[in-house]
């Protein structure tokens, strides 16, 4: 069994190295920004939303294209739930330092958890997407 797990880990590692998760990251970032444009973002903000809607985000065409490419990539992990979880964790890790607000981080996590389902794939049952708040200091 240990041998099988070792092979499984190696296979997952090479799958992750081959995968291009950027379309997923682009899709998710566009999605959470579009949602904030639509619904308002800072309950403490005076009268107007801090950010005005962007015509590019509003169109959503770019985002659906990213989603399609993202789903194609995630499809590779369908038969390995643990590896699917690692892919999601990698996406979270790659974007965590872009999210400098609690709401943004939570919304990104929510959308990320829903991603496999949106792609018509099984979502991993237990998958810890926690990162240090406000992204990691990489500099």
């Amino acid at each position: 069994r240990q041998q099988w797990e070792l092979q499984g880990d190696r296979r997952c590692q090479s799958q992750l190295e081959r995968a291009n998760l950027r379309p997923c990251e682009q899709h998710l970032m566009q999605k959470i920004q579009r949602d904030e444009d639509s619904y308002g973002r800072d309950p403490y903000s005076p009268s107007q939303d801090p950010y005005s809607p962007s015509p590019y985000d509003r169109r959503g065409a770019g985002s659906s294209q990213h989603q399609e490419r993202c789903c194609n990539e995630l499809n590779e992990f369908e038969n390995n739930q643990r590896c699917m979880c690692e892919a999601l964790q990698q996406i979270m890790e790659n974007q965590s330092d872009r999210l400098q607000g609690r709401q943004q981080e939570q919304q990104f996590k929510r959308e990320l958890r829903n991603l496999p389902q949106q792609c018509g794939l099984r979502a991993p049952q237990r998958c810890d997407l926690e990162v240090e708040s406000g992204g990691r200091d990489r500099y």
Epitope: R22, E25, Q26, L28, M29, Q30, Q33, R41, D42, P43, Y44, S45, P46, P50, Y51, S54, Y56, H66, N94, Q95, R98, L99, Q100, G101, R102, Q103, Q104, E132, S133, G134, G135, R136, D137, R138, Y139
Partner: antibody, heavy 118, light 111 residues
């Protein structure tokens, strides 16, 4: 009404210390990264330091690394900048700013003047 | 460290006329998520800075539509379609790809 109010500025001798405070009201202070930015007389804006909403991550400009420490007190909705080993070139108006959540500086205080002079 | 170079450093303008400021980065500001982490700020005389444009081309709320941002990678531009007297001040670009750094500023004053 969004308000960020800096205090603690003043005249200090080189090598001495000073602690700036920034009191926040009307914004979700505890949910966002906070920044300190300064502007020296006759110069441009210089980003100084930032602290993530949970206080876990701290970021510093090279010019202040090892001398300045950023911190926050969630219970008081207050941001701090502890400035040690002050130099003449640290003379500036210091602003605190709240991040938008996407790394832009959305809300700014009015600033407090720090003068380092013997 | 990423260095931002603005030009011109001083820009005399005529109300009603267009104006444009350039910001060049020492390295690409495109993140892997597709966004350019480049903002524009304006500091009017005697005031605190204010956010005008974020992520290269998105206008912050309350900012008049005469302000627009464009560019990608290392070359960015802030355009004012028709300058008004209230637009005077110092304009800064700022990168947020790696920590945060500002350009040296462009002083815009009425002719």
């Amino acid at each position: 009404q969004v308000q960020l109010v800096e205090s603690g500025g003043g005249v200090v001798q080189p090598g001495r210390s000073l602690r700036l405070s920034c009191a926040a009201s009307g914004i979700a202070f505890n949910d966002y990264t906070m920044h300190w930015v300064r502007r020296a007389p006759g110069k441009g804006l210089e980003w100084v330091a930032a602290i993530s909403y949970g206080g876990t991550n701290k970021y510093y400009a090279d010019s202040v690394k090892g001398r300045f420490t950023i911190s926050r007190d969630s219970s008081k909705n207050t941001l701090y900048l502890q400035m040690n080993s002050l130099r003449a070139e640290d003379t500036a108006v210091y602003y605190c700013a709240r991040d938008s959540g996407y790394r832009s500086l959305l809300h700014w205080g009015q600033g407090t003047l720090v003068t380092v002079s013997s | 460290e990423i260095v931002l170079t603005q030009s011109p450093l001083s820009l005399p303008v005529t109300p009603g006329e267009p104006a444009s400021i350039s910001c060049r980065s020492s390295q690409s500001l495109v993140h892997r998520n597709g966004y350019n982490y480049l903002d524009w700020y304006l500091q009017k005389p005697g005031q605190s800075p204010q956010l005008l444009i974020y992520m290269a081309s998105k206008r912050a709320s309350g900012v008049p539509d005469r302000f627009s941002g464009s560019g990608s990678g290392t070359e960015f531009t802030l355009k004012i379609s028709r300058v008004e007297a209230e637009d005077v001040g110092i304009y800064y670009c700022m990168q947020a790809l790696q920590t945060w750094t500002f350009g040296q500023g462009t002083k815009v004053e009425v002719n």
